[in-house]
């Protein structure tokens, strides 16, 4: 099997009304706290240059990011959703665990560092811009994977 | 240069099926989601499906779920829009359209120049 | 299916700046980073004039820019120009991963 076939989400992740409202719901509870409008994290700049097959694993360095650094920073803000979606989002992470691509993946790293760059330069803005960005995390998650 | 050809239109009574294609080239096709948009004479635009690069997430507005069905052949780079239990508010000029960018089909950036299906008795 | 709310009709004389608005529920345009802008004019395909709720793509004139805030997303046409004159539809994807149009405003250069 090649190496990406394990970069796959069942549709039924994403087909639990529930959950999909809570995190479009967290992602707007943010974005109104969202003043500097004319970054997007999610949007052309990162998927340049990545293939569609690839994408999967582009997302799931985003993901774990957004985890890591970005919502557990923030887990005290934008109850209830909040301590909803983590574990949802936790769940996605580990399906994605042994999703890995072979070959080169030099534009997916560089365009995942100027992400997290564009997050680390903005301090607790760019925590808060990535939580309101929810919504394109997650369809970009259901659309790549 | 992208290109999106549609073809397929024709009459069809009311209840009749069609079968909509759309032939893409000038870009990598199985790095794109793709949509059918439709516009009825004298009227507004209407999303009518999605699907992503690889078909496996396809989405229906409200008005066509159950009786049409989106497809895509990345060997062939075409995309197909089969429409069963056809009805006269289904009459409207039928666009095929791609995401600006790889990893967001919603954002249409490119149109073909649309199939016209007329739904009459 | 829901609805994304545009006035039918917006009017303008050359030079001037003008906005249309396009409003939705919570759980349209309020709660997505996924509004786009269409222009059409009569007898032609759709053409994408503003994506992201305020990407531009390259060859679109700067003189249009696309904002949210809010249920609520506006494009602004400023230095409005004869070829202005056209159809434009908002559109944004919704929660059950559906795309809705707005219902077109048609706007009108004065003069």
């Known amino acids: 099997l090649p190496i990406n076939s394990q970069c796959k989400l069942e549709a039924a992740n994403f087909q639990q009304p529930y959950i999909v409202n809570r995190t479009f719901m967290l992602a707007k509870e943010a974005s109104l706290a969202d003043n500097n409008t004319d970054v997007r994290l999610i949007g052309e700049e990162l998927f340049r240059g990545v293939k569609a097959k690839d994408q999967c694993y582009l997302m799931k360095q985003v993901l774990n990011f957004t985890l890591e650094d970005v919502l557990l920073p923030q887990s005290d803000r934008f109850q209830p959703y909040m301590q909803e979606v983590v574990p949802f989002l936790t769940k996605l992470s580990s399906h994605l665990s042994p999703c890995h691509i072979s070959g080169d993946d030099q534009n997916i790293q560089k365009n995942v560092r100027q992400l997290k760059e564009t997050v680390q330069k903005l301090g607790e803005s760019g925590e808060i811009k990535a939580i309101g960005e929810l919504d394109l995390l997650f369809m970009s998650l259901r659309n790549a994977c | 240069e992208v290109q999106l050809v549609e073809s397929g239109g024709g009459v069809v009574r009311p209840g009749g099926s069609l079968r909509l294609s759309c032939a893409a080239s000038?870009?990598?096709?199985?790095?794109?989601?793709m949509n059918w948009v439709r516009q009825a004479p004298g009227k507004g635009l209407e999303w009518v499906s999605g699907?992503?690069?690889?078909?496996?997430?396809?989405d229906y507005a409200a008005s066509v779920k159950g009786r049409f069905t989106i497809s895509r052949d990345n060997a062939k780079n075409s995309l197909y829009l089969q429409m069963n239990s056809l009805r006269a508010e289904d009459t409207a000029l039928y666009y095929c359209?791609?995401?600006?960018?790889?990893?967001?089909?919603?954002?249409?950036?490119?149109w073909g120049r649309g199939t016209l299906v007329t739904v009459s008795s | 299916q829901a609805v994304l709310t545009q006035p039918s009709s917006v009017s303008g004389s050359p030079g001037q700046s003008i906005t249309i608005s396009c409003t939705g529920a919570?759980?349209?345009?309020?709660?997505?980073?996924?509004v786009s802008w269409y222009q059409q004019h009569p007898g032609k395909t759709p053409k994408l004039i503003i994506y992201d709720v305020n990407k531009r793509p390259s060859g679109v004139s700067n003189r249009f820019s696309g904002s949210k805030s809010g249920n609520t997303a506006s494009l602004t046409i400023s230095g409005l120009q004869a070829e202005d004159e056209s159809d434009y539809y908002c559109a944004s994807l919704v929660s059950d991963f559906s795309v809705v149009f707005g219902g077109g405003t048609k706007v009108t250069v004065l003069g």
């Open positions: 699907v992503n690069w690889n078909g496996g997430t396809r």
């Open positions: 000038g870009f990598t096709f199985d790095d794109y989601g």
């Open positions: 919570s759980g349209d345009v309020g709660a997505y980073n996924f």
């Open positions: 359209a791609r995401g600006w960018y790889s990893g967001a089909a919603w954002n249409m950036g490119y």
